[in-house]
């Protein structure tokens, strides 16, 4: 008999696809960074699987990830942020698959917040402002933002505006009168650091005034 089935779990594991994706978030909790990974196949059996990162770390050779449901993550100050780290999926001491990744190229910024819209009656426009925690950060400071807005009744007709500042002006004549709008914003690294879009900010809702409305007041949120 062949020894192929002697360690069924491990042999089965070797037949599976353990490809995974990760993103980093720098200074996400004070000076702590985080790294989050997940298997690309959400149905993979993760019971005995662990993640480990080695290399490009400060003071230690390797670090183990914590597990939350199907997510693996680390929060640490020990990322060197220079050079590539080796991230491996392991069963016990055996590595099933590894990836060499520069953590500065897989950065996902934190979501913008405090999004608001103020109507200026005299100027016939709407001033959109929002905040980002990255203005206070040491590393990922420069971002490109994607502001998306739609008339609430138009399920998937989003208009997108890209900008590098945290302020945008929308002209009243470009919007429908007496209509409800939803607006949201997300961010992506735009200088030195590379990576992915942040989560969307919470949506903000505003109503445009009637064309002949002299007060022009918006419902405050």
């Amino acid at each position: 008999e062949s020894g192929y089935a002697q360690n069924g779990d491990l042999e089965d594991a070797e037949l599976d696809d353990y490809s995974f994706s990760c993103y980093s978030q720098l200074e996400v909790n004070g000076s702590q960074h985080s790294l989050t990974c997940a298997f690309e196949d959400p149905d993979v059996n993760i019971t005995n699987l662990e993640f480990e990162i080695c290399g490009a770390l400060v003071e230690v050779k390797c670090l183990n990830f914590r597990k939350l449901q199907e997510i693996y993550f680390i929060e640490t100050k020990k990322f060197l942020l220079i050079g590539k780290s080796n991230i491996c999926v392991k069963v016990g001491e055996k590595s099933l698959t590894c990836k060499k990744i520069d953590l500065t190229t897989i950065v996902k910024p934190e979501a913008p917040f405090d999004l608001s819209v103020v109507y200026r009656e005299g100027a016939n426009d709407f001033v959109v402002t929002f905040n980002t925690s990255h203005l206070q950060k040491k590393y990922v400071k420069v971002l490109m933002h994607d502001v998306a807005y739609r008339q609430e009744k138009d399920e998937n007709k989003w208009t997108h505006v890209n900008l590098s500042s945290t302020k945008l002006t929308l002209l009243q004549r470009k919007l429908q009168p007496a209509a409800m709008y939803e607006i949201k914003v997300r961010s992506i690294p735009d200088h030195y650091f590379k990576g992915f879009w942040s989560e969307w900010s919470p949506s903000y809702y505003f109503r445009t005034p009637e064309i002949n409305n002299s007060s022009g007041e918006m419902d405050p949120i």
């Epitope: 989050t36 939350l68 199907e70 997510i71 979501a111 989560e199 969307w200």
Partner: nanobody
């Protein structure tokens, strides 16, 4: 299709408390951001509270110190404990679960049907 179901709404006197819950019928990805919004009579929908997968919370100024948002990732549920309720808290409360995409998971944006909260003496 994932469904979100809110519960816990009702009528209460000023100063009273209610606890809203939001449960999902399907498996919600752990990294999703969970949010409570509300819409009062004749008003636009507004943010009440947000909780990220990491447990970071954000509140609207009008509810700070009175409302507490929490979540249970193992059960895919979110709660909103509302204390010191005021008449101006009267609204339909909606839960929202969002994931912007990444890690080979498609983006999603799910909304509940809403639960009515009425604060009146």
């Amino acid at each position: 299709q994932v469904q979100l179901v809110e519960s816990g709404g009702g009528s209460v006197q000023p100063g009273g408390s209610l606890r809203l819950s939001c449960a999902t019928s399907g498996s919600i990805f752990s990294l999703a951001t969970m949010t409570w919004y509300r819409q009062g009579p004749g008003k636009t929908r507004e943010l009440v509270a947000v909780i990220t997968w990491r447990g970071t919370t954000t509140y609207a100024d009008s509810v700070k110190g009175r409302f507490t948002i929490s979540r249970d990732n193992a059960k895919n549920t979110m709660d909103l404990q509302m204390n010191g309720l005021k008449p101006e808290d009267t609204a339909v409360y909606y839960c929202n679960v969002k994931w912007g995409g990444g890690l080979n998971r498609a983006p999603f944006d799910y909304w509940g049907q809403g639960t009515q909260v009425t604060v009146s003496s």
